[in-house]
């Protein structure tokens, strides 16, 4: 999907009112030092890009992050505010649905986490530089 | 303007069926998480069930296996389908649009579902 | 999984200061919403996302999240604010949860 023509704005409204207490009480417990940011981006349909990426696509070490709760409310702001977004995703959702896992919190999901919380502060500070 | 309104509601015995329908407009319903919340007369608000745009569904654990939430983006319709119904199931059922799957910012008007013999 | 507990009833007097609370565990670590119901009328969002108004609701409400406890507040309660009050979070199992609902009195 090209996440060129959604509402940014709307996007990060969504995120700062109803998605980044989620991620922060996922990662409860843990330090924000421990992970090192090794997930990056470029500009604002490149941060949606990687954050769908990390959020919904299974990854080694940790398969359940798309039955979080942070999950669920990025795919319904993705839907309502990127055109044809919806569309695009009933196939894959299909074939999620048949592979469909336990939720398990694991290191590696930790990390992960973390990863999506920078990705995520990039995207909400479009103007910044790429470090 | 945004709308939600909601039919189906009526009398029934207990044991028996019914399936109440959501008519959406004004906006791209085939977008939206949509939810049926419940009230019964006197009583507070209990959330029934939910579905996201691809179908995938979550119900409270007092309907699950009785109660089966649908929609048909391209009639802008929502469904709740209630078999096996309560004396308890009794309410006035609410069709509603769950904002990020989360905050409910449109209401229908609601229809009032009797169970009794 | 997580319940909220309102208390039943709180009564005010015409321009003072109304707090409704709504307890649950670790709450402060969820977003919660809030909504207004008038008799025979629909639910009306008043806040979301712990604090935030919707447009169209008045500046005298306002809402606070933390530790295990949320608050509404409506500071210069008026005659219309008579109405029940209802809390609402999301469990760890992705299903929506209402409190019991406060019933606001305008003395």
């Known amino acids: 999907y090209d996440f060129t023509n959604c509402d940014f704005e709307k996007i990060k409204a969504a995120y700062l009112s109803t998605i980044s207490k989620d991620l922060i009480t996922y990662m409860s417990g843990t330090k924000s030092t421990e992970f090192n940011n090794t997930v990056s981006c470029s500009n604002r349909p490149h941060c949606l890009t990687e954050i769908q990426s990390l959020t919904f696509n299974p990854t080694a070490g940790c398969a359940s992050l798309a039955k979080e709760m942070f999950a669920m409310k990025t795919k319904a702001a993705l839907a309502i505010w990127c055109p044809g977004y919806s569309e695009t995703q009933i196939n894959a959702t299909q074939a999620m649905k048949k592979r469909r896992k336990r939720k398990v919190t694991t290191n590696k999901c930790l990390e992960q986490v973390s990863q999506l919380q920078g990705l995520w502060r990039r995207f909400n500070r479009p103007l910044l530089k790429q470090q | 303007q945004v709308q939600l309104v909601e039919s189906g509601g009526g009398l029934v015995q207990p044991g028996g069926s019914l399936r109440l329908s959501c008519a959406a407009s004004g906006f791209t319903f085939s977008s939206y998480y949509m939810s049926w919340v419940r009230q019964a007369p006197g009583k507070g608000l209990e959330w029934v069930s939910g579905i996201f745009f691809d179908g995938t569904t979550y119900y409270a654990d007092s309907v699950k296996g009785r109660f089966t939430i649908s929609r048909d983006n391209s009639k802008n319709t929502l469904y709740l389908q209630m078999n096996s119904l309560r004396a308890e199931d009794t309410a006035v059922y609410y069709c509603a649009r769950q904002q990020y799957f989360d905050h409910i910012d449109i209401w229908g008007q609601g229809t009032l579902v009797t169970v009794s013999s | 999984d997580i319940e909220l507990t309102q208390p039943p009833s709180v009564s005010v007097a015409p321009g003072q200061t109304a707090r409704i609370s709504c307890g649950g565990d670790?709450?402060?670590?969820?977003?919660v919403y809030w909504y207004q119901q008038k008799p025979g009328q629909a639910p009306v969002l008043v806040i979301y996302?712990?604090?935030k108004r919707p447009s169209g609701i008045p500046e005298r409400f306002s809402g606070s999240n933390s530790g295990n406890t949320a608050t509404l507040t409506i500071s210069g309660t008026q005659a219309e604010d008579e109405a029940d009050y209802y809390c609402?979070?999301?469990?760890?199992?992705?299903?929506?949860?209402f409190g019991g609902g406060t019933k606001l009195t305008v003395l």
């Open positions: 670790s709450l402060g670590g969820k977003y």
């Open positions: 609402q979070s999301y469990t760890n199992a992705l299903s929506t949860v």
């Open positions: 996302g712990d604090s």
